[in-house]
């Protein structure tokens, strides 16, 4: 049975998948797929790693952490509800039927978006800037402080310059709510 | 064998810094992560923070950001971890670990840090 | 941060029991979830990792179960020297966090 993960339209999602390498540098191959894990491989592959790289990968799917140490963890830039469904990680260890294969549920929440009569200013309050870095290891929020005053023309543009520099928005912890009045 | 080697007992006054050593011997510190933990007396394990030797990319447990840092010397296989402005809270043993990759597999034998006017 | 909430805190037991110290998470981890012991005086020590793989050198009275939210670490035919703390830790998720602890005691 697969197990159960949550993001929010216009974050990340992060599916975390780990092995412990025989020794380093003995890497063994993974290979991400959308779908439940069939019997071999994965079906419809988003990312694979062989013995030494990353060596197919498709947009907006990257490994949040260090592969190199064992961490296969996925995660998938800016989704959208099509994102939804099961993803397999399968870790490709050697010798007939040996694999470990973990089904991931994938489950899209529409973005919290609520009108309220506030003033415009007050979406600096609601919003800090969020961000994940592309850093090594499992997803970690960290505030960098305040967005200046913004208004309503401006958000696309905010997060269009999130994504396209890699710091990804993620608001998955932060309960943050995006008031515009 | 893997071992991990701590620096010695400090004995430190209050608004001071330290650093503490962890040398290892048996693998590379490249091929891991490692970590550092907290443990006051009687109490649990609180996780402080890891280091990527391979690019000195670090994490952080938010209530030790801005006062725990953690290097790497890849040179001479050893990872430090710096404490500032010291107060009894931080009294405490420190141990440092590596990670392989999400569970701690060997742990240093630990670092007692003793802060005291 | 993930909160992961250890019962009981302490435990006492007669020699030849089995008992179980329960570990919950605040959400999904999946199996990223690690047991140790530390005996008194000592440093911690591996037990179990990914929920239910013994760690090299462990005695097979040890075991884990368990997923997602809900974990089992489970001492069969207690001896003398199993008297410790235990500690359960997941590492889904940084910060990585640990269950407050389970002192065990012999009657």
């Known amino acids: 049975s697969e197990v159960e993960y949550r993001a929010e339209v216009g974050q990340n999602a992060y599916l975390p998948c780990f092995y412990t390498p025989a020794a380093p540098g003995n890497l063994v191959p993974v290979c991400w797929g959308k779908g439940a894990c069939p019997v071999f491989e994965c079906g419809n592959v988003v990312l694979r790693t062989d013995e030494r790289d990353v060596n197919y990968w498709t947009s907006r799917y990257w490994l949040n952490g260090d592969f190199r140490k064992g961490d296969v963890s996925l995660t998938i830039e800016n989704v959208t509800l099509a994102d939804s469904g099961i993803y397999c990680c399968r870790i490709q260890i050697p010798g007939i039927m040996n694999d470990e294969k973990f089904n991931l549920k994938l489950v899209i929440k529409p973005a919290k978006v609520t009108p309220a009569p506030t003033r415009q200013r007050d979406f600096t309050a609601a919003f800090p800037r969020m961000l994940t870095t592309r850093g090594h290891g499992p997803a970690e929020t960290q505030t960098l402080g305040s967005l200046p005053d913004i208004n309503l023309t401006q958000i696309s543009t905010l997060a269009n310059e999130l994504r396209d520099s890699r710091l990804a928005n993620d608001l998955r912890d932060s309960g943050a709510t995006i008031r515009i009045g | 064998e893997v071992h991990l080697q701590q620096s010695g007992a400090e004995f430190m006054k209050p608004g001071a810094s330290v650093k503490l050593s962890c040398t290892a011997s048996?693998?590379?510190?490249?091929?891991?992560?490692m970590h550092w933990v907290k443990q006051r007396t009687e109490q649990g394990l609180e996780w402080i923070g890891r280091?990527?030797?391979?690019?000195?990319?670090?994490k952080f447990a938010p209530k030790f950001q801005g006062k725990a840092t953690i290097t790497a010397d890849t040179s001479s296989n050893t990872v430090y971890l710096q404490l500032s402005s010291l107060t009894s809270e931080d009294t405490a043993v420190y141990y440092c670990?590596?990670?392989?990759?999400?569970?701690?597999?060997?742990w240093g034998q630990g670092t007692t840090l003793t802060v005291s006017s | 941060d993930i909160q992961m909430n250890q019962s009981p805190s302490s435990l006492s037991a007669s020699l030849g029991d089995t008992i179980s110290i329960t570990c919950h998470a605040s959400?999904?981890?999946?199996?990223?979830l690690s047991w140790y012991q530390q005996k008194p005086g000592n440093i911690p020590k591996l037990l179990i990792y990914?929920?239910?793989i013994l760690h090299t050198g462990v005695p097979s009275r040890f075991s884990g179960s368990g997923s997602v939210t809900g974990f089992t670490l489970t001492i069969s035919s207690l001896q003398p020297e199993d008297i410790a703390s235990y500690y359960c830790?997941?590492?889904?998720?940084?910060?990585?966090?640990f269950g407050g602890g389970t002192k065990l005691e012999i009657k």
């Open positions: 830790q997941q590492g889904q998720n940084y910060p990585y966090t």
């Open positions: 280091i990527d030797p391979d690019d000195g990319a670090t």
């Open positions: 990914k929920a239910s």
């Open positions: 048996g693998f590379n510190i490249k091929g891991h992560y």
């Open positions: 959400q999904n981890i999946n199996v990223w």
């Open positions: 670990t590596r990670s392989n990759p999400y569970y701690f597999d060997y």
